[in-house]
């Protein structure tokens, strides 16, 4: 008949498993339970995936690996006494008197429960990496952490190459023995030890459990170090940069840590496993029963098969590893799990021209000299789209793309952003807001929803802020409804009249040129160059200023560039920016200075795009270390990442305007990076490409 093969990871666990199997058989519990011996939790997961075993209890990190790499699912969860249902919370604690926040942890002294432990290491380190605060190069998490904090106590890190930094705050026992041991010999080991490290002033932040402070303050601790401590003298660091009282851990934590859970193959009936274990716990979880499911004392060990602190086992409703782990823990694990042995030795960068090949070659050499990992290789392609194809086909790994190309890369080729560019504020031509400008007019005020029948001014046909974004946005919002993909006719019928300068006016609706004025002699009307006085962003604004149009679609800088004395041409010399307003998507109007909150879309910065199976944290980790050395255009290290002047080109590999590469943070998809408004505008336009 049916049997469930439990995987044990050690001799004591195999012993307990045998006893549990025997106890279940005696009690007539079906199906029968067998025990399979694995060498480790990882090995057991492989055995289950290979159908040589069926079930094992795993911690959060192992559940993540088992689910992501082997398709296993959690079906039964542990519940613990004194805990919050099937989970507890990982928190960061600081002294109330300090000024530390989650954003200022760089350089502070840190206290950890132990190396590779969930709340003391995995969650905080994973969270800092995933949120972009801590960059890791070449999967060397230990080095990254040792560089990031200003000294730490991480019990168990004494065997690593970075013990000087990671064990700097550890003190051992009263006689100085066992410094940095992952055992009670180290006074700063475990939850209470990490908190003690903070309380005694050795460290500035402690990564512990939600209950640790309350269990070790206000007279609850017998040891002398904790007797005078008050919980009110400590605070929690929240992910949004604020701080909170130590009792506020439900709202202010780094992650909710899931309980251990029993995992099985996707094709295994989770209900069957729960019924088996439920029968078992009903009979064998109380004191005095012949077999104790939730005790390991008889075997001289702890936490065999199940955690000893388990009070009951419960069925898991949504049997996916993502749902069980929760998004906070899941995100932290994404940041942490980086196997140096599985890290490709090379990052193959896509290049599109001879100057770009030259710069990429120099970048590869410069990075290699500084021992940056992974090493850069340069691979040619014919076009951005060809790059996308080659990345998808795993012939190349990365390329920097503009907004429209990011959209195609994400939507058509499944690529994701790994890092982004950031430009100085003066560089508003590289990333800017698209705005709808109107005259401030209280008597004839209209909103974005009331544009039908108005007169419109556009920089030119196909210009991002003058045409693509506003028209795309109006299509997406359902105001303009093209028939048979004829956008031009639809726009010409939506507005009463327009000026949309164009280079090829064949089959061009006359109303799209109706407001155009041409040059001083009235010639070259509606041409797509500066001979048409209403051409370009400046011209579109002039069209509004001179009352030819009611709305101008321009960049957020356009009004400022042509008012308050910034443009001395006669038409602009006396203009004041206060006389103009923006139309907002929510139906309101706003001051022209409020462009960041009132716009049709932001033209996004360029981003480095990769396959979704590429570890984005290693890509950003490489670029971040590289920009420390090569990012400043005045560096003396022999290569300039964000300057192309040595190669007789512009914007090679990265835009020259880039002042730094930034992590993507929560913008981990092409939609997230581009922003909903920009995507909506592109989708509005692309829906018409028949």
């Amino acid at each position: 008949g049916m049997e469930v093969r439990w995987c044990a990871t050690s001799d004591p666990e195999q012993h307990k498993c045998g006893n549990m199997s025997e106890a279940f058989r005696e009690a007539g519990i079906q199906p029968s339970l067998l025990c399979v011996r694995g060498t480790s939790a990882d090995h057991c997961v492989q055995l289950i995936a290979a159908q040589e075993a069926d079930a094992i209890t795993l911690d959060g990190g192992a559940i993540y690996e088992a689910g992501k790499e082997h398709g296993l699912k959690p079906v039964v969860g542990e519940v613990y006494d004194q805990e919050v249902g099937t989970s507890y919370y990982a928190v960061a604690v600081v002294r109330r008197s300090s000024h530390v926040t989650i954003d200022t942890l760089k350089g502070v002294k840190s206290c950890h429960t132990g190396i590779n432990r969930t709340v003391g290491w995995n969650v905080p380190v994973g969270y800092l990496v995933e949120s972009g605060r801590l960059s890791v190069m070449g999967c060397d998490v230990l080095k990254a952490v040792s560089d990031y904090f200003g000294g730490s106590c991480v019990p168990g890190a004494g065997e690593t190459s970075y013990s000087e930094s990671l064990c700097r705050l550890c003190r051992g026992d009263s006689s100085g023995e066992g410094v940095c041991d992952k055992s009670p010999l180290e006074r700063y080991y475990d939850y209470s030890g990490a908190f003690r490290c903070l309380a005694e002033g050795a460290g500035d932040v402690a990564f512990v459990k939600h209950s640790t402070v309350l269990e070790n303050t206000d007279g609850k601790t017998l040891p002398s170090w904790g007797q005078a401590l008050l919980s009110q003298d400590f605070e929690l660091l929240c992910r949004d940069g604020s701080r909170a009282d130590v009792t506020e851990w439900r709202q202010c934590h780094l992650a909710r840590v899931p309980a251990h859970a029993v995992v099985v193959r996707a094709d295994t009936d989770g209900g069957l496993i729960f019924r088996l274990l439920n029968e078992g716990q009903r009979l064998f979880s109380h004191e005095g029963s012949s077999f104790q499911m939730f005790s390991s004392e008889a075997y001289g060990q702890k936490d065999l098969l199940f955690k000893d602190s388990t009070s009951e086992l419960v069925p898991i409703a949504t049997q996916t590893y993502e749902a069980w782990l929760g998004h906070e823990y899941l995100h932290a694990m994404k940041g942490l799990l980086c196997d140096p042995n599985r890290l490709p030795p090379y990052l193959r960068w896509c290049v599109l021209s001879t100057p770009e090949i030259q710069k990429c070659g120099d970048m590869a050499v410069a990075f290699r000299r500084q021992r940056l990992k992974p090493e850069i290789q340069c691979v040619s392609a014919k076009s951005p789209q060809h790059c996308m194809e080659r990345i998808q086909a795993e012939q190349v790994d990365a390329v920097t793309l503009s907004g429209e190309d990011i959209y195609t890369a994400g939507k058509t080729y499944g690529l994701v952003p790994a890092a982004g560019e950031h430009y100085a504020p003066e560089d508003s031509s590289n990333s800017y807001y698209v705005v709808a400008v109107v005259r401030r007019d209280s008597s004839h005020a209209f909103t974005l929803d009331e544009l039908r029948g108005k007169r419109s001014c556009h920089a030119g046909f196909g210009s991002p802020a003058g045409w693509d974004v506003p028209v795309g946005a109006l299509i997406q919002r359902g105001f303009i409804r093209p028939k048979d993909c004829d956008v031009l006719t639809a726009v010409s019928e939506f507005f009463n009249a327009s000026c949309v300068p164009v280079n090829n006016p064949k089959n061009y609706p006359s109303s799209l040129c109706a407001l155009c004025v041409g040059d001083e002699q009235g010639r070259n009307k509606c041409v797509g160059n500066s001979q048409e006085r209403y051409y370009g962003y400046r011209g579109a604004f002039r069209c509004l200023v001179e009352n030819a149009g009611d709305v101008a679609f321009v960049r957020h800088t356009t009004v400022f560039d042509n008012t308050n004395g910034h443009n001395s041409e006669p038409w602009a010399a006396e203009l004041r920016s206060e006389d103009y307003e923006l139309l907002c998507p929510n139906g309101a109007r706003a001051e022209v200075s409020q462009f960041a909150a009132c716009n049709l879309a932001q033209i996004p910065p360029h981003a480095v795009m990769v396959r979704p199976d590429t570890n984005i944290f290693t890509v950003y980790g490489l670029l971040d270390k590289a920009q420390d050395l090569f990012g400043d255009d005045h560096n003396k290290n022999g290569f300039k990442m964000f300057d192309s002047s040595n190669y007789h080109g512009q914007d090679l590999l990265f835009k020259d305007a880039t002042v730094r590469a930034v992590p993507v943070g929560e913008k981990t998809t092409y939609r997230g990076w581009l922003g909903l408004d920009y995507v909506a505008a592109l989708e509005g336009m692309s829906s018409q490409q028949c």
Epitope: A424, D427, S429, F560, S577, S593, A597, V659
Partner: antibody
């Protein structure tokens, strides 16, 4: 009217961390760029860095390994942390705003706070 | 970094006189977008710097029209047509065309 006010300790010990707060009234730190500048004895001004409306930071490369600028939008405050200070960091520290209206010149400054690094 | 050199270091003037301060950049301050991000500040004794002129020649709100800025490329000038007592202090030029922004060393305007 836009006003910025710096606050923080006037004396910091060498190797410690200098922490300053800039409290802003009359404008929201969720628009524009919010900067730190310092002035050394003898009048030399040095630009330190900014935090943008979207929370992105830029730091002067000469300070990059030691500086951190953060913000708390709920309090309309932003902060400067400078680690491992030495006597060379003795200066008057200013916070200032940059917006498009003046093409990102620093149009409003705090009154400054004098910081001495000494044991 | 881009070096901004101001001359003179000190400028003694009589009230009512014209004053002229020069600022020279080590490289052109014309940005790729065509703008020139050269600004002038005045720091009165015991106060913080205040913006006078932005983008070469634009007076900030509230700044009297006796202040004017000019120049292009690498050479820029601030002129005060008739110096008043409230104009005394240290004048700084600053560029933000290139990152990081940099300041000149200052010119002290004082009474003769």
């Amino acid at each position: 009217e836009v006003q910025l006010q710096e606050s923080g300790p006037s004396l910091v010990k060498p190797s410690q961390t200098l922490s300053l707060t800039c409290s802003v009234t009359g404008d929201s730190i969720t628009s524009g760029y919010w900067n730190w500048i310092r002035q050394f004895p003898g009048n030399k001004l040095e630009y330190m860095g900014y935090i943008s409306d979207s929370g992105i930071t830029y730091y002067n490369p000469s300070l990059k390994s030691r500086i951190s600028i953060t913000r708390d939008t709920s309090k309309n405050q932003y902060y400067l942390q400078l680690n491992s200070v030495t006597a060379e960091d003795t200066a008057t520290y200013y916070c200032a705003r940059r917006t498009l209206a003046t093409y990102y010149a620093m149009d409003y400054w705090g009154q400054g706070t004098s910081v001495t690094v000494s044991s | 970094d881009f070096v901004m050199t101001q001359t003179p270091l000190s400028l003694p003037v009589s009230l009512g006189d014209q004053a002229s301060i020069s600022c020279r950049a080590s490289q052109s301050l014309v940005h790729s977008n065509g703008n020139t991000y050269l600004h002038w500040y005045l720091q009165k004794p015991g106060q913080s710097p205040k913006l006078l002129i932005y983008r070469v020649s634009n007076r900030f709100s509230g700044v009297p029209d006796r202040f004017s800025g000019s120049g292009s490329g690498t050479d820029f000038t601030l002129k005060i047509s008739r110096v008043e007592a409230e104009d005394l202090g240290v004048y700084f030029c600053s560029q933000s065309t290139h990152v990081p922004p940099t300041f000149g060393g200052g010119t002290k305007l004082e009474i003769k």
